[in-house]
């Protein structure tokens, strides 16, 4: 769809005669017909088959035509056409007198006519005007033409209709030759695809605008390009959705178990070293001087009874003092001024004489100790049970009673489930959190290594001259079936060619 | 492609039993280890139990310790919950979950859940 419009400039009719030579009364009020049609090589009258127009009386005799509306017509002069630009066409521009105020053909006598002009040509689509000019005889007629597409089409012969667009089917203006020109943001052949924030996952982000991201279920992040783990995920990550891979030092389906207690908690006090032992469960070892669960109790100096023969021991800030009873001295009241003769033994303790009489020792009964058999034997004062352990008196012995995971005389011993050696044909035994896992040898397989996992011996084709191998599932070791005239463990001797034996 | 399908999930009374399966495919089956979560409706998911690649390894949640036993059948490439002395609270939509690896560490693949409701 286009417009062919022509541009009247000026008309001389200098003689203001009609196209018979008689003149007009009293001058010749000019108006134009013109008719466009297809192309003819010679005009011939007939339909305008691309289209008709006509102006008002534009002046008399000779005149300028302006450039804009005049009389009610215009000018340029419109003739619109509903189809593709042939890129040819065919002209007549007709001056006819109009006596009266009656334009249409009938209305005017035959012999009105001042002058007729017929063109053809080719004429391609474009701003440019053409500009021509055209005399007869009597008359000239200066004027310019041009074909334009209407709004929106475009192309050579006007024939691709594009419409501007900003809408859910399209965001997009138009380029001179009819392409669409994409809105900044959108893409796609018609414009209707927005280009996303720069950087936005493309299997895991998407947008429906511009410069915007939006994440797929299970991701996150500005970009879309963060794993969202597992609903209840703890300490854990993840490289796909709905994973939780747990992080160093963590376990449980959703990485909420503790298996390393020391280093998340830091339980034990005063320099103590810690050790786990399982989901929640750790052991610390006190230094010298401190004791409890968490080594968190300061052992007072006096609390080893370093005071004897009944001295009396008092704490001080740069260790203790021993105050002796009367008849011994020394730091520790070691030292006795007495001897047998004075009965230094208490609770039944037999007195020896030491030094030639200077000196005595008692030997005590059981469950009393001391120079002098004066304490009954604690045997839980040293806090000989290791890892937590609680030391019992049971009369003249002692006992501890382990916490979980530990075991010996003295809980000293972490329990262990390899101990018992539950790895089957050499497996190696590994102690694990909550139980053990065997590390089978070729060949044994299963939780404790007790299946036997069958060695194909023939995998390394050991029969010769196209003998049967057959692996011996008892022994591991194969079987040669020998064809007819081979003997041999390999079927490697021919029959008739015994065998040069060693012995 | 890994799959796990539970079943034996239902309507159990109060002080009731019911013994969950889990069936599984598209690895090697004795190589990892395999665990049951429960999740009811408007709670976070709770990790119940789960037993080691070996079968050597189990862990309970105190919530389950002692009526709940989780066993492996490597043969079956099955996994089980017997779950006993049923409580009203332990109402959920029972998965099975394998965290891809030996240990019980985490969670990789899931199944669709099988549905346990305890009422009278």
């Known amino acids: 769809s286009g417009v062919f419009q022509l541009q009247l400039q000026e008309f001389i009719n200098e003689r203001g005669v009609l196209a018979s030579g008689r003149p007009c009364e009293p001058g010749c009020r000019t108006f134009f017909r013109v008719c466009l049609k297809h192309f003819q090589a010679v005009v011939s009258p007939g339909p305008c088959t691309f289209g008709t127009v006509s102006t008002p009386v534009l002046g008399t005799n000779s005149f300028a035509v302006r450039d804009d509306s005049s009389g009610g017509g215009r000018n340029p002069l419109q003739l619109p056409f509903n189809f593709t630009w042939p890129g040819t066409f065919s002209l007549i521009i007709e001056a006819w007198h109009a006596p009266g105020d009656d334009l249409r053909p009938e209305a005017l006598p035959p012999d009105a006519l001042i002058s007729k002009i017929a063109i053809q040509g080719s004429l391609a689509v474009g701003q440019n005007w053409l500009l021509d000019e055209q005399t007869s005889t009597l008359t000239r007629l200066r004027y310019s033409y041009r074909v334009i597409c209407s709004d929106n089409y475009y192309g050579d012969n006007c024939s691709r209709l594009c419409k501007k667009r900003n809408d859910h089917f399209g965001h997009y203006v138009c380029q001179p030759d009819g392409n669409l020109s994409c809105l900044p943001g959108w893409t796609g052949e018609y414009c209707q695809q927005p280009i996303c924030l720069s950087g936005c996952h493309e299997q895991n982000g998407y947008c429906s605008k511009p410069a915007e991201c939006l994440c797929r279920p299970g991701w996150q992040g500005r970009l879309c390009n963060e794993c969202i783990p597992h609903n209840g995920c703890r300490h854990g990550t993840c490289s796909t959705p709905w994973q939780c891979t747990c992080d160093e030092g963590w376990g449980g389906l959703f990485c909420d178990q503790d298996l390393n207690y020391c280093t998340h908690h830091s339980p034990c006090k005063n320099g103590a070293t810690c050790s786990n032992s399982g989901q929640r469960s750790y052991t610390c070892t006190c230094r010298p001087g401190y004791t409890g669960v968490d080594c968190e109790l300061e052992l007072s100096e006096c609390d080893s009874n370093p005071c004897r023969n009944g001295g009396s021991c008092k704490d001080q800030e740069d260790g203790y003092h021993c105050l002796c009873p009367p008849g011994y001295y020394g730091l520790h009241c070691e030292h006795s001024t007495l001897s047998c003769a004075d009965s230094p033994c208490f609770n039944g303790g037999s007195c020896r004489e030491r030094n030639q009489g200077a000196n005595y020792a008692c030997e005590c009964p059981p469950n009393f100790t001391g120079s002098n058999c004066e304490k009954k034997v604690d045997r839980c004062t040293s806090n000989p049970c290791a890892n937590g352990g609680q030391c019992l008196n049971r009369g003249p012995s002692r006992m501890c009673r382990c916490r979980p995971g530990f075991t010996g005389t003295y809980c000293e011993l972490h329990v262990s489930d390899c101990a018992r050696n539950p790895c089957a044909h050499g497996g190696t035994c590994h102690d694990l959190e909550n139980g053990l896992m065997c590390t089978c040898p070729a060949g044994f397989s299963g939780r404790r290594c007790e299946v036997r996992t069958s060695i194909d011996a023939c995998a390394s084709s050991p029969c010769f001259n196209r003998a049967t191998c057959y692996t011996d599932l008892s022994t591991d070791t194969f079987v040669c079936n020998c064809p007819y005239g081979f003997v041999g463990s390999r079927c490697e001797f021919p029959v008739g060619l015994p065998p040069s034996f060693p012995w | 492609e890994v799959q796990l399908v539970e079943s034996g999930g239902g309507l159990v009374q109060p002080g009731g039993s019911l013994r969950l399966s889990c069936a599984a495919s598209g690895f090697t089956f004795d190589d990892y280890a395999i665990g049951w979560f429960r999740q009811a409706p408007g709670k976070e998911p709770e990790g119940i139990s789960c037993i080691s690649s070996s079968g050597g390894i189990t862990y309970y949640a105190d919530s389950v310790k002692g009526r709940f036993t989780i066993s492996r059948d490597n043969a079956k490439n099955t996994v089980y919950l017997q779950m006993n002395s049923l409580k009203p609270e332990d109402t959920a939509v029972y998965y099975c979950?394998?965290?891809?690896?030996?240990?019980?560490?985490?969670?990789?693949?899931t199944g669709q859940g099988t549905q346990v409701t305890v009422s009278s």
């Open positions: 979950a394998t965290p891809g690896i030996a240990a019980c560490r985490g969670i990789h693949y």
